[in-house]
Amino acid sequence: DAHKSEVAHRFKDLGEENFKALVLIAFAQYLQQCPFEDHVKLVNEVTEFAKTCVADESAENCDKSLHTLFGDKLCTVATLRETYGEMADCCAKQEPERNECFLQHKDDNPNLPRLVRPEVDVMCTAFHDNEETFLKKYLYEIARRHPYFYAPELLFFAKRYKAAFTECCQAADKAACLLPKLDELRDEGKASSAKQRLKCASLQKFGERAFKAWAVARLSQRFPKAEFAEVSKLVTDLTKVHTECCHGDLLECADDRADLAKYICENQDSISSKLKECCEKPLLEKSHCIAEVENDEMPADLPSLAADFVESKDVCKNYAEAKDVFLGMFLYEYARRHPDYSVVLLLRLAKTYETTLEKCCAAADPHECYAKVFDEFKPLVEEPQNLIKQNCELFEQLGEYKFQNALLVRYTKKVPQVSTPTLVEVSRNLGKVGSKCCKHPEAKRMPCAEDYLSVVLNQLCVLHEKTPVSDRVTKCCTESLVNRRPCFSALEVDETYVPKEFNAETFTFHADICTLSEKERQIKKQTALVELVKHKPKATKEQLKAVMDDFAAFVEKCCKADDKETCFAEEGKKLVAASQAALGL
């Protein structure tokens, strides 16, 4: 489907508003440190150029690829070398190497100030004064902090962001209306970013086949009534969409995502009975709704899997002649029967099945060799079931904050070399699995918990990749995508770790802790907990609990004191001394 001018084609397909928004997202995800005004200028220049190409597709440079056009534009930034250092060397390369170079320099943890939410009245004034700039700024700030955010989905978030301000800035109590909506968008946005980051990591680190396998399993669970050929078509199209977005081809990605939503809605009868409501919505809502749609009911009377995958005389022939199709069918058939399994478990089962066939098919009696293959699945299924049961019991016993602390201690002992902010962030997120998933019935716990943990552990993997400090993290992150969680679960205390030198400054606190939100105060305490474990990795749960209880009491006491700062200074010294004694430091 060749077009004389790719930029004109995408401009016409997407419309000016979406075109501009997507170019802004693309530029902000590449040049994460550039000021907003610079990006707006570049976007306007690209948009004006696109309009000339719409008017005349044969005009000069209109035949150039989007990577060439966008890359040339990014390389006009005057401060590229001083702001980005070696990323400026990308500009000496030709496409496609130049785009690959820009992609490699995307920073998952950019050194950007925390986004501070202004007063509601200030935000509403800014929104009314210049709605377009206000919304562009939202796209820019999210995109630069989340360089892999799923661009068409960010357009959906921006639409909801606009709707929140439109509604709430007219409300009697603006804050009561707006703040919960903004909190919800923030939390959903972080979750969406992390989920997409896993998709991109899957494609970039483990290849297209790994992503396709994930997609076959997930779509088969979601659309169990759809035929294998239909699921395969959706997987191929979905893979193209995510490959494009992860590769920075945001215009193509958004365009293809819209086409996929259109196809799904036109063919919902052969896909799922749950799509009706989604398909009545406008484009952005429709695509989001389809992505989140609940699993359809399983067809009644599905035959046993053994007939085609164990008992058939053609098992080995089918495997050898077309592994992708045969193993894809196995995964499809298993997944549609098991909405109660996590996707990663289904992928482990498929891998076990594949390994067994590879081992058995050349044997003298292949059938005898692989006849008991399904028995090998039992321990693989029981392992996450037992782990989730244990951890949900612990969560129900402790509550979220203390459950997070238990995980902080557990993971700091496993990988103490990892930076404290990363351990705090990742363990807090791991701990959220409790409130997110433990409330579900048994049949929904595993897909909720283990697939969520895959997303969180991927955050650890991408943050660690930027500054690798632990061979154990590298090993768990790179060896197998589907075995990351079991790999981390299996890690014991790192006996090779040399405890960190004690530094009193780390445990010195000031009155400013009293004005922090409950969440920020928790983070401060959890940071101290990680540091404690790094100093004393062999400390028992009881010792750590005693110190943390003393610490909580100390903060509470000093925050009630008249002279808070003096209290923190004097009581802090006592606390440090008592803690050192309690831990034998």
Epitope: C316, A322, K323, A362
Partner: antibody, heavy 119, light 110 residues
Framework: EVQLLESGGGLVQPGGSLRLSCAVS????????INWVRQAPGKCLEWIGI?????TTFYATWAKGRFTISRDSTTVYLQMNCLRAEDTAVYYC???????????????WGQGTLVTVSS | DIVMTQSPSSVSASVGDRVTITCQSS???????LSWYQQKPGKAPKLLIY???KLTSGVPSRFKGSGSGTDFTLTISSLQPEDFATYYC???????????FGCGTKVEIK
């Protein structure tokens, strides 16, 4: 000592047929997969096909129809029909590493037998 | 069509040198089904590495295989006199019928 020994090579006219043998000693052939691989003078290695322990065979796409692999208790055969000049090569038999069925891991090789197709 | 490209086609090196040979596959190989063979004149090939990075028993640790998907590398960290030979990569794919070898890299004495 485990050995694979090819025989049956020689000069053959275009359009002719030839049957190569691979005698296996030192192991029970009924437990292993055996491949045929060829190498034209100064050229690449080229996989021809495989016979599994069960007797099931698979061939390279280009080899289907003209080449047939079979076996008895101690020998694996490669029947070659409608031979052409471009089939001139050293033909090797090789064992697939035990524990694999479709992977290109061949740990034991014969010394090869030269087939020359020429008028 | 399956294409397996080895580069360089030949390399001249001295004893003690580090030598790197690459193998590019299109499409990607199945499940890291990638092997490396060494062949000396008049002899049969010898399996060095399987599953892209696993050393066959008895192969010296100076041989190292790496890579995944479409791009693979064989590195000889410190070339020894007995390492002068031709090296081939072999790839397995979704269909066994597509089993393919690269066309070799000849490592010669400088």
């Amino acid at each position: 000592e485990v050995q694979l020994l090819e025989s049956g090579g020689g000069l053959v006219q275009p359009g002719g047929s030839l049957r190569l043998s691979c005698a296996v000693s030192g192991i029970d052939l009924s437990n292993y997969a055996i491949n045929w691989v060829r190498q034209a003078p100064g050229k690449c290695l080229e996989w021809i096909g495989i016979i599994w322990a069960s007797g099931t065979t698979f061939y390279a796409t280009w080899a289907k129809g003209r080449f047939t692999i079979s076996r008895d208790s101690t020998t694996v055969y490669l029947q070659m029909n409608c031979l052409r000049a471009e089939d001139t090569a050293v033909y090797y038999c090789a064992r697939t590493v035990p524990g694999y069925s479709t992977a290109p891991y061949f740990d034991l090789w014969g010394q090869g037998t030269l087939v020359t197709v020429s008028s | 069509d399956i294409v397996m490209t080895q580069s360089p086609s030949s390399v001249s090196a001295s004893v003690g040198d580090r030598v790197t040979i690459t193998c590019q596959s299109s499409p990607s190989v199945w499940s890291n089904f990638l092997s490396w063979y060494q062949q000396k004149p008049g002899k049969a090939p010898k399996l060095l590495i399987y599953e892209a990075s696993k050393l066959t028993s008895g192969v010296p640790s100076r041989f190292k295989g790496s890579g995944s998907g479409t791009d693979f590398t064989l590195t000889i960290s410190s070339l020894q006199p007995e390492d002068f030979a031709t090296y081939y990569c072999g790839g397995g794919y979704s269909s066994i019928s597509d089993t393919t070898f690269g066309c070799g890299t000849k490592v010669e004495i400088k």
